[in-house]
């Protein structure tokens, strides 16, 4: 058993049918010695008396808020949560496996630049009695500071018969140098509590590996005289690291017809302009990627050919 | 993804082309190592990230863009002395800081070159003959060093009398390649920045 926060305790259980569970001793936080009784949750049934209460915690029915009283007055509370270990592996019931970029990906994180600021998000089908707490650091043995905000509900989607809820959090490394070469990964730890179930999820990454630039901005077309060709131009996104000559991007320019089946013409360039043939009803899209370290491509910025 | 090959103009900063070739070569070598050594811990998540140049050179600090010198987090600089007679830039433009930066890059390349050559000698003794260093990568390191044209004492190649542990050598190769790729990215950024300025 360990303390998650004041008066909230996590009991770790090897989870299988007929498991013996864990013996837990609760102590009433009071100078009183006599006439103390214990109850669980809203029940008035007295579970025991005395300054300490010994219980065998086996299932969720044994978890909850234990309260010690004296003469109708509440002295203190202890909330017991359960953390299930199923055949050596901690349960992951609360969050959905996003399966991207690989199986067992519960937390996904992205950064728009090298400033040390990043966003993480996760999915769940649970709508109520759910709380999250996020901590982060650079490295784990001698951790350096990363400050995270509160996790917030950022999106709701309908997936078949189920509703899916997306939560996200923003974090900022306390003293980040955009040019630094990372040797210790960022660690993100999310505590999740649903009713009386506790779970924790972790993700470990280098900022360089989660970079996804914003799409190029100010995408414009300039027709070339007496030609079906157009000059496409764009700019680096505002959120990208500066100076741009050091943090350079490379770009992919795509001409896409109305029909998804039509052949796509693609050009790769390091410049912020390109000359392409604009077909009728086609659209021109441009996306960006770090020129020197191949992390994710940005989303597309698009304009119609007409 | 193959990086676009830039053909430098005659007046262009001559090291940019070499640094792009270097990044391409080390990225290809790392990809090859990860595929060939799939049963070894060779991914970024599995290896320890060691920097053989730590406390010996200070490339990131010495080559910091002017715009980032205001960022206090970037200025935990280490005192390092370097030879300053580089030839990558037209001599008029070679400021003291630039020379310091380029000589730091040169020292990095020299250190990695020695490590890679020592390692290749061990890998050539492996009866499995599973993986060797790409000669193209070694050649590209050499070309960039020549373009930088710094005079510096030659570091003797390390020779080891004991029987090599091939498993450890292959893991060390992965560690070195990951670190060298990160340094090659920094070198490319620096060359691009110097070329623009």
């Amino acid at each position: 058993i360990w303390e998650l926060k004041k008066d909230v305790y996590v009991v770790e259980l090897d989870w299988y049918p007929d498991a013996p569970g864990e013996m837990v001793v609760l102590t009433c936080d009071t100078p009183e010695e006599d006439g103390i009784t214990w109850t669980l949750d809203q029940s008035s049934e007295v579970l025991g008396s005395g300054k300490t209460l010994t219980i065998q915690v086996k299932e969720f029915g044994d978890a909850g808020q234990y309260t010690c009283h004296k003469g109708g007055e509440v002295l203190s509370h202890s909330l017991l949560l359960l953390h299930k270990k199923e055949d050596g592996i901690w349960s992951t019931d609360i969050l959905k496996d996003q399966k991207e970029p690989k199986n067992k990906t519960f937390l996904r994180c992205e950064a728009k630049n090298y400033s040390g600021r990043f966003t993480c998000w996760w999915l769940t089908t649970i709508s109520t009695d759910l709380t999250f707490s996020v901590k982060s650091s650079r490295g784990s043995s001698d951790p350096q500071g990363v400050t995270c905000g509160a996790a917030t509900l950022s999106a709701e989607r309908v997936r078949g018969d189920n509703k899916e809820y997306e939560y996200s959090v923003e974090c900022q490394e306390d003293s980040a140098c955009p040019a630094a070469e990372e040797s210790l990964p960022i660690e993100v730890m999310v505590d999740a509590v649903h009713k009386l179930k506790y779970e924790n999820y972790t993700s470990s990454f280098f900022i360089r590996d989660i970079i996804k630039p914003d799409p190029p901005k100010n995408l414009q077309l300039k027709p070339l005289k007496n030609s079906r060709q157009v000059e496409v131009s764009w700019e680096y996104p505002d959120t990208w690291s500066t100076p741009h000559s050091y943090f350079s991007l490379t770009f992919c320019v795509q001409v896409q017809g109305k029909s998804k089946r039509e052949k796509k013409d693609r050009v790769f360039t390091d410049k912020t302009s390109a000359t392409v043939i604009c077909r009728k009803n086609a659209s021109i899209s441009v996306r960006a990627q770090d020129r020197y370290y191949s992390s994710s491509w940005s989303e597309w910025a698009s304009v119609p050919c007409s | 993804r193959n990086l676009p090959v830039a053909t430098p103009d005659p007046g262009m900063f001559p090291c940019l082309h070499h640094s792009q070739n270097l990044l391409r070569a080390v990225s290809n070598m790392l990809q090859k190592a990860r595929q060939t050594l799939e049963f070894y811990p060779c991914t970024s998540e599995e290896i320890d990230h060691e920097d053989i140049t730590k406390d010996k050179t200070s490339t990131v600090e010495a080559c910091l863009p002017l715009e980032l010198t205001k960022n206090e987090s970037c200025l935990n600089s280490r005192e390092t002395s370097f030879i300053t007679n580089g030839s990558c830039l037209a001599s008029r433009k070679t400021s003291f800081m630039m020379a310091l930066c380029l000589s730091s890059i040169y020292e990095d390349l020299k250190m990695y070159q020695v490590e890679f050559k020592t390692m290749n000698a061990k890998l050539l003794m492996d009866p499995k003959r599973q993986i060797f260093l790409d000669q193209n990568m070694l050649a590209v390191i050499d070309e960039l060093m020549q373009a930088l044209n710094f005079n510096s004492e030659t570091v003797p190649q390390k020779s080891s009398l004991e029987e090599p542990d091939f498993y450890k050598t292959k893991i060390k190769l992965c560690i070195l390649l990951h670190a060298f790729r990160i340094r090659a990215v920094t070198i490319d950024r620096v060359m691009s920045y110097l070329n623009a300025s």
């Epitope: 007929d18 299932e59 270990k85 199923e86 055949d87 050596g88 592996i89 019931d93 690989k102 067992k104 | -």
Partner: antibody, heavy 115, light 112 residues
Framework: QVQLVQSGGGVVQPGRSLRLSCAAS????????MHWVRQAPGKGLEWVAF????????YYADSVKGRFTISRDNSKNTLYLQMKSLRAEDTAVYYC????????WGQGTMVTVSS | SYVLTQPPSVSGTPGQRVTISCSGG????????VKWYQQLPGTAPKLLIY???QRPSGVPDRFSGSKSGTSASLAITGVQAEDEADYYC????????????FGTGTKVTVLG
């Protein structure tokens, strides 16, 4: 004590369907994940499928994906395996089993796919 | 489709020490715990070892398990006639958990 009692096995022609059941007692069935495992005559153990405690997630072996469906009815304390498009290579003893470091197995039920 | 490899058979005379190996990889045994089962003819498998080296109550102490790196082994010290059975190791793969990964199985024969 924990008990898993299986039923539903038998002889079936290729291409036909069969549903296996596993009735659980002696524990809070709705709190535990469950597996199906099979064993072809004279062969080793092969995992078939898994279902989470609340039925929210199901996992299948590639060899049965798209043909077999694992399900559970927590109000009836029963686990099911719906098998469709049966093949000769599905002939085996099928076991249900609890998920955990200590597990409990059903007695097994024989499924024979033969024309 | 078996990723955990066991010897097809091992044998020993009563009182001898018999060991069965189970060889896997970094993504299965290397990152997860191992179980061992005993299966007597015509019966369901019985758990012998869990969490690599733990014995459930009721399992004789002549059975012991160990794990090192990407391999595990089961030892029967002082093998007895009633130990003649099939033995299976089981683990998980970190990419496909909770799918059970079984070993190929080993037939233990007690001679004489």
């Amino acid at each position: 004590q924990v008990q898993l009692v299986q039923s539903g096995g038998g002889v079936v022609q290729p291409g036909r369907s069969l549903r296996l059941s596993c009735a659980a007692s002696g524990f809070t069935f709705s709190e535990y994940g469950m597996h199906w495992v099979r064993q072809a005559p004279g062969k080793g153990l092969e995992w078939v499928a898994f279902i989470r405690y609340d039925g929210s997630n199901k996992y299948y072996a590639d060899s049965v994906k798209g043909r077999f469906t694992i399900s559970r009815d927590n109000s009836k304390n029963t686990l099911y395996l719906q098998m469709k498009s049966l093949r000769a290579e599905d002939t085996a003893v099928y076991y249900c089993k609890t998920h955990g470091s200590h597990d409990n197995w059903g007695q097994g039920t024989m499924v024979t796919v033969s024309s | 489709s078996y990723v955990l490899t066991q010897p097809p058979s091992v044998s020993g005379t009563p009182g001898q020490r018999v060991t069965i190996s189970c060889s896997g990889g970094r993504s299965n045994i290397g990152s997860n715990t191992v179980k061992w089962y005993q299966q007597l003819p015509g019966t369901a498998p019985k758990l012998l070892i869990y969490y690599n080296d733990q014995r459930p109550s009721g399992v004789p102490d002549r059975f012991s398990g160990s794990k090192s790196g990407t391999s595990a082994s089961l030892a029967i010290t002082g093998v007895q006639a009633e130990d003649e059975a099939d033995y299976y190791c089981q683990s998980y793969d970190r990419g496909t958990h909770p799918a059970l990964l079984f070993g190929t199985g080993t037939k233990v024969t007690v001679l004489g």
